[in-house]
């Protein structure tokens, strides 16, 4: 069974001091990752017993193995069902605690009832505050039965449930009609899936005979031991104040387990700790009684004395539960109640015995669950005992179960059953996960789901370059931590596999499936330098840069230009995909914007250091285009242009710019400024005769505006070759501005 205990502190003078603690003794409990099992959950279950809403309860985790619920503000907060869930996968187990109000009208004589399939269960509700009304019994919150108030027997209302079956399990309550549900008596009925002393799918297997009030689990045949007892059959008492499957937990506080209710996995239910009884577990056992709820009687013989925590303490020369066995009868000594081995191992099992006459090698035998008897291969004889060593054949899963060591001499015989758990070494079901990669290292998460049994003691990561025949490199890592594979080759694929191990000899599992992980390419190290930039328009910027002159090949795939518009909080990134490029034209920028510009070399996804930044101010956008541009030849060397001013001007025009180009010519166009913005006409002089020209123009305010439509016109024929075009405004014939 899962080692899970729910403790309730029942010192109820102040609800604010009340707390529930759930403690797990499971390996790896509460780590919370897929591979190692989900965390402990502790909560109030309001599905059946609902209480008025109050402030939320506080959940505190103490490490991965313990969780505590506090923050109860009034007694009614405590009433109801609480549950703790722990364990992983198929072992996920819910432990339930039912809390009754000490001031309720009706109180249960016994809260938890564990019965066998087919038994008759009797639930007894004691009258605490009498009401002369009927009593309603409910099962899991639904109406079940009514008793007339006259039907109380000796101040108790009894509910008899004959021939109970597992579906009858659940929360039962007895409530006076029209009384508050918080005044009910709440019970928990646990019906084992088998008859008394049986377990298994068809109830065909025999329980081991649980001692000291332990209850045989109907699914796996294990004894769920009361708090304070341990061993395969609960044969061993823990030291006072200890609990848990291996007595590994300790009751908090100076008064030990007084005032604590212990709830364990079904079919045990809840009880006081060993040595305590009463509704609040605050009363010590009466003389002659011991164990959980003081349910056990000592009946010590041969001068044994009764200890309320552990039972009979035998005088020298006697042993046994009641000190009924003479030490002359052979006795198995210090046999572990549970042993764990890994599948396909061949362990050695020791069994020691004492007695008079002294046991010899042949008088000690080992019996497997299938009835096979093993004889010891050697024995070590010491003055006070003989230890027989058994070499076990290769273990198979069917060897899991109860083994028995038996000693027989003429003085009698003794046997000790112990549980052998054959565990399957873990095998990863998935490949490890790549978290991050660099040029020479891979960071890998080795935590993967696995088949077989935990806990995981070591994780080995095996890796080598893909398609390589070289030996695998191996690194042993902590199960809970990511691992960095270092000193790898850049831009190389590696095959990576996980191997998991569990404790013990032969605990190494098979290697998991491989995965391919590729290292990044080397980080680019060179820092570019911005060398120049110039504005090619209100929204266009030409940028040039250089790289330091260093020997060796250039490590890089290209450049990233970054433009930061601090006013708008926007970044523009321009990728230049050639590492040979040293210039770029940035278009579609926002006119009139102050940009911070830098450039970085990149390689794969890695960025190198940025150049020191430049600050660039783009000119504002110019005005709209002039309208209705028209050209008219005046002579063999003159053409007159006329136009209309642009509409919707954002401000006064500072000048016009005319572009002149020979139609079909290959040369650069000529730009001529018209410095009198009020004009709507100008004469372009110095043109060649009989030549076709193209004209367009634009206005300037702070920046140059949009171009107008293009117009064509030819000069008149038979003139001389002119020196080149010039412009003359209609009102400014005295000055030519080329």
């Amino acid at each position: 069974a899962v080692d899970l205990t729910l403790l309730a502190n029942l010192r109820l003078t102040d609800p604010q001091r009340f707390f529930l603690t759930c403690v797990s003794g499971e390996a790896g409990a509460g780590r919370g990752s897929d591979a190692w099992g989900p965390p402990l959950l502790l909560e109030k279950d309001d599905r059946i017993v609902r209480t008025p809403p109050g402030p939320p309860l506080r959940l505190a985790r103490n490490g991965s193995h313990q969780v505590t619920l506090r923050g109860f503000s009034k007694p009614s907060d405590l009433v109801g069902v609480f549950s703790c869930v722990g364990g992983a996968g198929a072992r996920r187990t819910r432990v339930i605690y039912v809390h009754n109000s000490p001031g309720a009208h009706l109180l249960p004589d016994k809260v938890t009832h564990t019965v066998n399939k087919g038994d008759t269960a009797v639930l007894s509700a004691r009258v605490h505050k009498e009401k002369q009304t009927d009593v309603i019994w409910k099962s899991n919150g639904s109406y079940f039965y009514t008793l007339d108030w006259h039907e109380a027997q000796d101040g108790r209302f009894l509910l008899q449930l004959p021939n109970v079956q597992p579906p009858s399990s659940g929360i039962y309550s007895a409530t006076y009609l029209e009384a508050s549900p918080l005044g009910s008596a709440f019970f928990r009925l646990i019906v084992r899936g088998c008859g008394a002393g049986r377990w298994g799918p068809g109830c065909t297997k025999e329980c081991p005979g649980c001692l000291h009030g332990g209850v045989c689990h109907d699914h796996d045949g294990e004894c769920v031991c009361p708090p304070g007892f341990t061993g395969t059959r609960c044969e061993q008492a823990c030291r006072e104040g200890r609990f848990g499957q291996s007595c590994q937990e300790q009751c908090p506080g100076i008064s030990g387990c007084r005032g604590l209710t212990f709830c364990l996995p079904d079919p045990y239910g809840c009880s006081c700790g060993s040595g305590w009884r009463g509704s609040q577990c605050q009363e010590a056992c009466a003389p002659g009684h011991f164990g959980a709820d003081c349910r056990l009687q000592c009946q010590c013989q041969n001068g044994g004395t009764c200890d309320r925590f552990s039972g009979c303490v035998c005088p020298s020369g006697w042993h046994g539960v009641h000190c009924e066995k003479s030490d002359r009868i052979p006795q198995i000594l210090n046999m572990a109640s549970e042993l764990e081995f890994n599948l396909e191992t061949m362990p050695r099992i020791n069994c020691a015995a004492a007695g008079n006459p002294f046991p010899v090698r042949g008088s000690i035998e080992l019996r497997k669950p299938d009835g096979t008897v093993l004889l010891s291969t050697k024995a070590i004889v010491e003055p006070e005992k003989t230890t027989a060593e058994f070499e076990v054949p290769r273990l198979v899963l069917a060897d899991s179960g109860f083994w028995e060591c038996r000693v027989s001499t003429s003085g009698g015989q003794d046997s000790r059953r112990f549980k052998v758990n054959v565990k399957v070494p873990p095998v990863p079901l998935a490949a490890p996960r790549l978290l991050t990669k660099q040029s020479r290292q891979l960071v890998v998460s080795p935590l993967v789901s696995f088949s077989g049994d935990g806990p995981i003691s070591t994780v080995r990561l095996h890796y080598r370059p893909q398609d390589s025949t070289m030996d695998w490199s191996t690194i042993v890592v902590d199960p809970s931590e990511n691992v960095t594979l270092m000193n790898l080759r850049p831009k190389t694929g590696y095959s990576v596999r996980v191997q998991l191990s569990r404790p013990g000899e032969g605990g190494e599992g098979a290697w998991g499936p491989p995965t391919l992980m590729t290292t990044d390419c080397p980080e680019p190290l060179l820092q570019p330098w911005l060398e120049g930039w110039h504005v090619e328009g209100t929204d266009r910027l030409r940028v040039s840069w250089s790289l330091p002159l260093v020997p060796g090949p250039l490590v890089g795939d290209g450049f990233l230009l970054r433009l930061w518009d601090g006013t708008r909080g926007q970044e523009r990134r321009e990728n230049v995909s050639s590492p040979q490029a040293r210039t770029a034209l940035l278009t579609g920028l926002t006119p009139g914007t102050h940009y911070q510009l830098d450039v970085q070399l990149y390689h794969c996804t890695l960025l190198g250091p940025a150049s020191p930044p430049a600050h660039v101010l783009l000119p504002p956008s110019g005005p709209p285009a002039p309208r209705h541009l028209h050209a008219q030849a005046l002579s063999d060397s003159e053409i007159q242009l006329t136009w209309k001013h642009p509409e919707a001007l954002p401000g006064p025009i500072s000048k016009y710019v005319v572009e002149v180009q020979v139609a079909g010519g290959a040369g650069d166009p000529l730009w001529i400024d018209v410095d009198r913005p009020e004009e709507t006409s100008t004469i372009i002089r110095g043109l060649n005769a009989s030549t076709r020209y193209l004209f367009r123009m634009r206005a300037s305010i702070q920046g140059l505006g949009d171009w107008s439509n293009t117009v064509e016109e030819s000069t008149l024929g038979n003139g001389l070759q002119a020196e080149g075009p010039v412009q003359e405004s209609r009102a400014a014939e005295e000055g030519l501005d080329q």
Epitope: Q527, W529, L530, E531, P548, L549, P612
Partner: antibody, heavy 119, light 107 residues
């Protein structure tokens, strides 16, 4: 062997001018960005100005902007710092330093030249 | 601008001892931090760049570590020639900035 040799320091009155030079040898000067860094007496290091390998890019600390001009002559393997409108707080040892190829670190430094601004 | 703060201002140790110098940035500088050594009357010398990379010719007793805002220069066993002033410098954000220096003196 990389060598940087500063010159041109000296005593100057407030408001005056000086031109510092830094002669470089032992490496391809035109392939590296260059810095001027200064250190006031008994104080720490302060970056002053930087210039790109071809000289197309220059940048200045706020404390000297508009007064100092960095330039270089790659044909002469020489770095310059023209300092105008000098103030008392400009008094320092001025170092020229080479920019490391992989970032804004300074891998080689000159021995420094002392500039004293005092009336 | 990113402020760089070095501590302690002065560190007094004996040859053979281990020296640990700290540098803290006013905001994260990733791993973009360098250390320089300056002896009296001399120019600074680059020791460590990008947090942990030793510059050419720097002995193995000098090592750097840290990331984000907190960085450490460690000299594993002090030699007589190591007593000097040490400066840190960031290159994460422009402009580059230096710490005010830590003076390492002989005890």
């Amino acid at each position: 062997e990389v060598q940087l040799l500063e010159s041109g320091g000296g005593l100057v009155q407030p408001g005056g001018s000086l031109r510092l030079s830094c002669a470089a040898s032992g490496f391809t000067f035109s392939g590296y960005g260059m810095y001027w860094v200064r250190q006031a007496p008994g104080k720490g290091l302060e970056w002053v100005s930087v210039i790109s390998p071809s000289g197309g890019y220059t940048h200045y600390a706020d404390s000297v902007k508009g007064r100092f001009t960095i330039s270089r002559d790659n044909s002469k393997n020489t770095l310059y710092l023209q300092m105008n409108s000098l103030r008392a707080e400009d008094t320092a040892v001025y170092y020229c330093a080479r920019a490391y190829s992989s970032g804004w670190y300074l891998d080689y430094w000159g021995q420094g030249t002392l500039v004293t601004v005092s009336s | 601008d990113i402020q760089m703060t070095q501590s302690p201002a002065t560190l007094s140790l004996s040859p053979g001892e281990r020296a640990t110098l700290s540098c803290r940035a006013s905001q994260s500088v990733s791993s973009y931090l360098a250390w320089y050594q300056q002896k009296p009357g001399q120019a600074p010398r680059l020791l460590i760049y990008d947090t942990s990379n030793r510059a050419t010719g720097i002995p193995a007793r000098f090592s750097g570590s840290g990331s984000g805002t907190d960085f450490t220069l460690t000299i594993s066993s002090l030699e007589p020639e190591d007593f000097a002033v040490y400066y840190c410098q960031q290159r994460s954000n422009w402009p580059i900035t230096f710490g005010q220096g830590t003076r390492l003196e002989i005890k």
